[in-house]
């Protein structure tokens, strides 16, 4: 349970996280399991420990083996094991199964491919993306943050996608590549009467006077592309733009998201410097499409600033 497989290619950077988490964690010590020899923390070493992370900069085939991490705190010491395998670089284009990360599925309208393990590294955009070893070019492909977006996905887009990025450590650059398979699902679209997921009908939202508050109006309208769909906020039955209170604004740009394959929209109402009079207003979340309109009403109530029993860091 507390062991994790990690792999990488020789001469590339590999960063591994300890599979045990501290609750809390004060220090983390790393050891070579076979020899019980401590792994240094000095960054001048090619292999060194940095808290929860074990860094191979760069990795060598001889680094393969099991590494022990001990998460120390006053109450308990927790032990985890990282099973690391470093492979030689392939001369041909084929990426063997043992170098593949989990397969992801996409559809015509949802085609994000995340670059595996990238959150462990100190990298800067943009990522380079390859499909079956060919650099991706053309307007259909967009490298966005840590993922690739493919517009108008077709069944031919299925295949093995490799992301390549540079990890920077103290001014030195190291290359990292990671590959995963992408499969394409056929998706039939449909439209239905709007379903508001948030807020709940007649919800009371607790706010602090003088603080900022956000209300999210979130609704789903069916599956696939929606011809007409919108979510918006009204104040006392009036559009936000017509209400004329500059402290209260709708967040621009309704992004169509696909949770569980559904086409959904979000609209955030931002209230700056909440005032007493804001508690008297009626806030309506409206969702509409060709089937009709649904409305959920929210009211604000004052919250005592630190009257919490479950504050956590």
């Amino acid at each position: 349970k507390f062991s994790k497989q990690s792999w990488g290619l020789e001469n590339e950077a590999l960063i591994v996280r300890c599979p045990r988490q501290g609750k809390p964690s004060y220090t983390v010590d790393w050891y070579y399991s076979q020899t019980n020899k401590s792994i240094p923390t000095q960054e001048r070493n090619r292999v060194f420990a940095s808290g929860q992370l074990l860094k191979f900069l760069p990795a060598a085939v001889a680094d393969s083996g099991i590494y022990t991490c001990i998460v120390r705190s006053p109450t308990f010491n927790r032990t985890g094991y990282a099973n690391v395998t470093i492979y030689k670089k392939q001369s041909d284009c084929n990426v063997p199964d043992y170098l593949m990360y989990s397969t992801v599925s996409g559809s015509e309208k949802n085609s994000k491919i995340y670059c595996p393990t990238i959150d462990l590294y100190n990298w800067t955009a943009p990522l380079e993306w390859f499909k079956n070893c060919q650099a991706l070019q053309g307007s259909r492909y967009r490298a966005h943050k840590s993922f690739l977006v493919i517009d108008n996905v077709m069944t031919e887009d299925a295949g093995d996608y490799t992301c390549k990025f540079i990890h920077n450590e103290n001014g030195a650059n190291y290359s990292v590549t990671a590959t995963r398979s992408f499969t394409v699902k056929d998706e039939q679209g449909f439209s239905l009467f709007p379903v508001i997921g948030a807020p709940a009908q007649n919800e009371i939202k607790e706010v602090e006077i003088g603080k900022n508050a956000n209300l999210t109006c979130s609704a789903c309208f069916g599956k696939g592309t929606q011809f007409l769909a919108a979510v918006l906020w009204q104040l006392n039955g009036t559009k936000i733009t017509d209400f004329g209170e500059p402290r209260i604004q709708q967040e621009e740009g309704q992004n169509q998201s696909f949770s569980n394959g559904l086409a959904c929209l979000d609209m955030v109402l931002r209230i700056a410097d909440v005032k007493e009079e804001d508690l008297l207003l009626q806030y309506d979340c409206l969702a509409l499409n060709l089937h009709g309109l649904r409305r959920h009403t929210v009211r604000l109530s004052r919250k005592n600033p630190i009257d919490h029993h479950s504050i956590y860091c």
Epitope: Q21, K23, P24, Y26, T75, R78, C313
Partner: antibody, heavy 118, light 112 residues
Framework: QVQLQQSGAELVRPGASVTLSCKAS????????IHWVKQTLVHGLEWIGA????????AYNQKFKGKATLTADKSSSTAYMELSSLTSEGSAVYYC???????????WGQGTTLTVSS | DIVMTQAAFSNPVTLGTSASISCRSS???????????LYWYLQKPGQSPQLLIY???NLASGVPDRFSSSGSGTDFTLRISRVEAEDVGVYYC?????????FGSGTKLEIK
């Protein structure tokens, strides 16, 4: 909202034992340590011990070793503290408390009042 | 055991003014990792304690920024910049550096 729901007040006779419970909701029970704290007017807040629900490992304050026994049931997300051979010194409010990555006593139960009296 | 020392009462403060509460530890709470393991809690009348500050100077989630904390390895101060009526209660400092974890005896915030 993370909640730790503790069992109700107890009145027990000297020499008896009692088991207090602490049920966690809205967070992963095994992702936290559960700590127990005693509060009296005389001694204030005193740390009794902690349990790691994931492994069942325990740590105790030497003062309460042999007096308190901590256990946890992962299936019901509940931690228990058994207090044995009780005397009037055991009369107190007992709190369970959950930890996070940065804090040991990040959130607290509502407390259980224990009265030891004949 | 590390002893945490607090005064039983604060100087009475007027609402809207600032208040300071002190705490002293019998041993430095500075860990080799560079973190000072000093925590502040507030216990309002009839309620459980609630976390205010962790690792000496970090504000816990949901706590107003009127609260701040500073100190060395052994001497610590909790400051409330504009005291409000709901801030009344007993303020405890605690150390999480080593077992057994220990708490101060608490300082009651008094309003004039």
């Amino acid at each position: 909202q993370v909640q730790l729901q503790q069992s109700g007040a107890e009145l027990v006779r000297p020499g008896a034992s009692v088991t207090l419970s602490c049920k966690a909701s809205d967070y992963i029970f095994t992702d936290s340590e559960i700590h127990w704290v005693k509060q009296t007017l005389v001694h204030g807040l005193e740390w009794i011990g902690a349990i790691d629900p994931e492994t069942g490992d325990t740590a105790y304050n030497q003062k309460f070793k042999g007096k308190a026994t901590l256990t946890a049931d992962k299936s019901s997300s509940t931690a228990y503290m058994e207090l044995s051979s009780l005397t009037s010194e055991g009369s107190a409010v007992y709190y369970c408390s959950g930890s996070t990555t940065d804090c040991y006593f990040a959130y607290w139960g509502q407390g259980t009042t224990l009265t030891v009296s004949s | 055991d590390i002893v945490m020392t607090q005064a039983a009462f604060s100087n009475p403060v007027t609402l809207g003014t600032s208040a300071s509460i002190s705490c002293r530890s019998s041993k430095s709470l500075l860990h080799s990792n560079g973190i000072i393991y000093l925590y502040w809690y507030l216990q309002k009348p009839g309620q459980s304690p609630q976390l205010l500050i962790y690792q000496m100077s970090n504000l816990a989630s949901g706590v107003p920024d009127r609260f701040s904390s500073s100190g060395s390895g052994t001497d610590f101060t909790l400051r409330i910049s504009r005291v409000e009526a709901e801030d009344v209660g007993v303020y405890y400092c605690a150390q999480n550096l080593e077992l057994p974890f220990t708490f101060g005896s608490g300082t009651k915030l008094e309003i004039k």
